[in-house]
């Protein structure tokens, strides 16, 4: 019973985690304009992995996709790759873990097979969570570096008279969603791996048999070994519902005639 609960909870936690990873990857607010010195701004900039957006004080929001691959920073490409790998691994893990669930019967699948699948999905969830955390952390590090660089060059004088204010960016909501989601996926994966141990069937212990050889006697005592559960991590596979991973920010970024102006 405890094993089933642990497995089920691991699945649900990972499912939520992967939904969060998908949501974070799709969100536009990975970096947002720093408003420390100016809390009310007429033009607000924010950027995601796939496009950058500008929201005017009128309420009008315009988003532009990054229609280039080669022109993008290598770090951004790396973050995209990490998030996509995390989603793919998580999705496969979820698929595997559905069949591994103890409460679901599929034909005459043995417990050892379910244990293997649970461990596989668990490991996949762990890797998926780590990918998401790594991706978000790389992006956050990039932001911190750029933030202090732009602070150092905050105002560049032109002819000693005109000031060009450099836009500084800080952590967006997507980073926090990504960190939490990655953590949940990781926790779910660990839970699946723990559940896997309880699923592994005990092998029969055979009585020791002594074999007497001429010369000197050596006793072989086989038995007492647990069946190997194989490998595989409990990676949760999250179902993507159409539009379900869309965030409030993203919905807002499509202006309608009734946007505030």
């Amino acid at each position: 019973m405890a094993v089933t609960a642990c497995q089920g909870l691991g699945f649900v936690v990972s499912l939520i985690g992967i939904a969060g990873i998908i949501a974070a990857t799709c969100m536009d607010q990975w970096s947002t304009q720093d408003l420390y010195n100016n809390p009310v701004t007429a033009v607000f900039n924010y950027q995601g992995l796939w496009r950058s957006c500008v929201r005017e004080s009128s309420g009008f929001t315009e988003c532009r996709g990054y229609f280039t691959l080669l022109g993008l920073p290598a770090m951004l490409q790396a973050v995209r790759a990490l998030m996509i790998v995390g989603i793919v691994l998580g999705a496969i893990g979820l698929l595997v873990s559905i069949f591994a669930l103890k409460c679901i019967r599929i034909g005459s699948m043995e417990d050892s097979a379910k244990a293997n699948m649970t461990l596989t999905s668990g490991i996949m969830f762990i890797v998926s969570g780590l990918c998401a955390i790594a991706g978000v952390s790389v992006f956050a590090n990039m932001l911190v570096t750029n933030f202090w660089m732009s602070t150092a060059n905050m105002y560049t004088g032109m002819g000693g008279m005109v000031q060009t204010v450099q836009t500084r960016y800080t952590f967006g909501a997507a980073l926090f969603v990504g960190w939490v989601a990655g953590g949940l996926t990781l926790i779910g994966g660990v839970m699946m791996c723990i559940a896997c141990r309880g699923l592994a069937p005990e092998e029969t212990n055979y009585k020791a048999v002594s074999y007497h050889a001429s010369g000197h006697s050596v006793a072989y005592k086989p038995g007492g070994f647990k069946a190997s559960t194989g490998f595989g991590s409990n990676t949760k596979n999250k179902k993507i519902y159409d539009g379900g991973a869309r965030t409030e920010d993203e919905v807002q970024s499509y202006p309608s005639k009734h946007d505030y102006v």
Partner: antibody, heavy 119, light 113 residues
């Protein structure tokens, strides 16, 4: 055609207050910011502030904080600007304007209200 | 606050002549996020409220004749009237709509000979 109707003139005494109205018609009042702009006779334009009719969220020019108060009455699609402790410096034409949909600029303007502060 | 400086303060031209007026801002009005310049040009005819001509420094408002052209980026902007008509007699204002408070230039008065 969007219409912003303002009273033509307001004659007030120094130290008194005045409430200038701006009645909107032919558009969804709650969907667009209302801005207020001051123009002294023969001079340039000065932005006073703006208000969003849907929730009365407002932004003021610091130079007019304490001088102007922006309010709206959604039931009558009317925006108001109250000016307090009036002096001769406040004698001017006050325009209300509707924020543009696509930018931060002012798309439509009222005809303006001339506020004259005189003893 | 961003200070908007317009030049010249007034100019007199003959009909069908080309005219150019300038506007300079104390800070860049170019937004890096969308590469747009947040500057608007208004026309105010005598006894009338201002009317928007150009927004985003170079985008003509619908219904505005194509003889009006806005250009410039960052801190320097110009409004050009390719062939001045009698009805163009007005004061022309530039406005910063990049940061609060929104500020206007002192205006350029266009007079026709």
């Amino acid at each position: 055609q969007v219409l912003l109707q303002q009273p033509g003139t307001e004659l007030v005494k120094p130290g008194a207050s005045v409430k200038v109205s701006c009645k909107a018609s032919a558009y969804t009042f709650t969907s667009y910011w209302i801005h207020w702009v001051k123009q002294r006779p023969g001079q340039g334009l000065e932005w006073i502030g703006r208000i969003r009719p849907s929730d009365s969220d407002s932004t003021y020019n610091q130079n007019f904080k304490g001088k102007a108060t922006l309010t709206v009455d959604k039931s009558s699609d009317t925006a108001y600007m109250q000016l307090t402790s009036l002096t001769s410096e406040d004698s001017a034409v006050y325009y209300c304007s509707m924020g543009a949909y696509y930018s931060n600029s002012f798309g439509y303007w009222g005809q303006g209200s001339l506020v004259t502060v005189s003893a | 606050d961003i200070v908007m400086t317009q030049s010249p303060s007034s100019l007199t031209v003959t009909a069908r002549e080309k005219v150019t007026m300038n506007c300079k801002s104390s800070q860049s009005l170019l937004n890096s996020g969308n590469q747009k310049n947040y500057l608007t040009w208004y026309q105010q005819k005598p006894g009338q409220p201002p009317k928007m001509l150009i927004y985003w420094a170079s985008t003509r408002e619908s219904g505005v004749p194509d003889r009006f052209t806005g250009s410039g980026s960052g801190t320097y902007f110009t409004l050009t009237i390719s062939s001045v008509q009698a009805e163009d007699l007005a004061v022309y204002y530039c406005q910063n709509d990049y940061s609060f408070p929104f500020t206007f230039g002192s205006g350029t008065k266009l007079e026709i000979k």
